[in-house]
């Protein structure tokens, strides 16, 4: 698995470099973390026929993915930092339980999979730091994830398959997005 | 061509307990999930257990009806799946089915059965 | 765990009648439901996958459909040999559900 952001050599070897802003390191964050997403996808690819299902096949599912709104305040159509970075770190929050699922849902990219959910939970804690209203952030009850947890992972194989696609690319938008909007604050 | 076998029917007492086997051939048997289904005499199909493959942890699943009395394993190298049941009584007398599942979760292959007894 | 109801629990149909056996999902279960023919002292055998696709070498005059939870098997032209019990299985998620099957009779 590839080197987490800020722990690699050359942030060692470079030590007149100037520390990077709270800003740049959630927006180098984010991008390993795409990265990391992006290889787990080539694995799912190549896996199965998932990537080139239909959008209608794949639109049909129980999944109750994080998503960004109109009302969130991201777009730059009625923009809103505040209520935006709460979106932000309220989706991390809910995509947890996901990323756990995903854990043992590769063969070759297992470090990989495991990459992704540590990063996540790094860049949490970094947006977190960020937030002035942290009151607003709702935690997902660990009961129900727990519940949630043990569904995904009773579905059949192709339904596994359907839902580790649907993470995945669902992860991927939502860090998208949510990499647009944190440049614009 | 796809083969299952069960084996380890019988008459059995009841309070005791058996051990059915289930051997296949003619797939890559490490790729599926396998389930055991019965049917008492005269009545309908009852879903038993589910052993999942490597891939998925070697997952156990079971019908609540026998939760606590049954038992799924498999042996990878010998292309077989068993089910223990113990704690047997008169109602567990079935036709006990060994079956493939596929990746869609439909049970594409059955063997032909084993009959289990349980009487005095 | 998920309920499968199936009704009717029997009915006997003329050649000429359209026949149809439904089953009821207690919840959500996508297109994950397989139909399943037994006859007397044989193995179930799969007609059709994924509620509405035949199972090879299965004729045409069977078909299935789905109506958010709820589930059809329809025979169009029933023959003497259709005569057998018809079960649906839940396939979703385990642990798995057959339904209580049906009893057709084709006079």
């Known amino acids: 698995a590839p080197v987490p952001p800020g722990e690699d050599s050359k942030d060692v070897a470079a030590p007149h470099r100037q520390p990077l802003t709270s800003s740049e390191r959630i927006d180098k964050q984010i991008r390993y973390i795409l990265d990391g997403i992006s290889a787990l996808r080539k694995e799912t690819c190549n896996k199965s026929n998932m990537c080139e299902s239909s959008k209608e096949a794949l639109a049909e599912n129980n999944l109750n993915l994080p998503k960004m709104a109109e009302k969130d305040g991201c777009f730059q159509s009625g923009f809103n930092e505040e209520t935006c970075l709460v979106k932000i770190i309220t989706g991390l929050l809910e995509f947890e339980v996901y990323l756990e699922y995903l854990q043992n849902r590769f063969e070759s990219s297992e470090e990989q999979a495991r990459a992704v959910q540590m990063s996540t939970k790094v860049l949490i804690q970094f947006l977190q730091k960020k937030a002035k209203n942290l009151d607003a952030i709702t935690t997902p009850d660990p009961t129900t994830n727990a519940s949630l947890l043990t569904k995904l992972q009773a579905q059949n194989q192709w339904l596994q398959d359907m839902t580790t696609h649907l993470i995945l690319r669902s992860f991927k938008e939502f860090l998208q997005s949510s990499l647009r909007a944190l440049r614009q604050m | 061509e796809v083969q299952i076998l069960e084996t380890g029917g019988g008459l059995v007492k009841p309070g005791g307990s058996l051990r059915l086997s289930c051997a296949t051939s003619?797939?890559?048997?490490?790729?599926?999930?396998m389930n055991w289904v019965r049917q008492a005499p005269g009545k309908g199909l009852e879903w038993l257990a589910q052993m999942r493959n490597k891939n998925y942890q070697y997952g156990t699943y079971y019908a609540e009806s026998l939760e606590g009395r049954v038992t799924v394993s498999r042996d990878d190298a010998k292309n077989s799946v068993y089910l223990q049941v113990s704690s047997l009584r008169a109602e567990d007398t079935a036709i006990y089915y060994c079956?493939?599942?596929?990746?869609?979760?439909?049970?594409?292959?059955w063997g032909q059965g084993v009959m289990v007894t349980v009487s005095s | 765990d998920i309920q499968m109801t199936q009704s009717p629990a029997s009915l006997s149909a003329s050649l000429e009648e359209i026949v149809t056996i439904t089953c009821q999902a207690s919840q959500d279960i996508g297109i994950s439901l397989s139909w399943y023919q037994q006859k007397p002292g044989r193995t179930p055998q799969l007609l059709i996958q994924?509620?509405?696709n035949l199972a090879d070498g299965v004729p045409s005059r069977f078909s299935g459909r789905r109506f958010g939870t709820q589930f059809s098997l329809t025979i169009s032209t029933p023959q003497v040999e259709d005569t057998g019990v018809y079960y649906c299985l839940q396939h979703n998620s385990a642990p798995y559900t057959f339904g209580t099957g049906t009893q057709l009779e084709i006079k």
């Open positions: 079956t493939r599942e596929s990746y869609y979760g439909f049970t594409s292959y």
């Open positions: 003619g797939f890559n048997f490490n790729d599926y999930f």
């Open positions: 994924n509620a509405n």
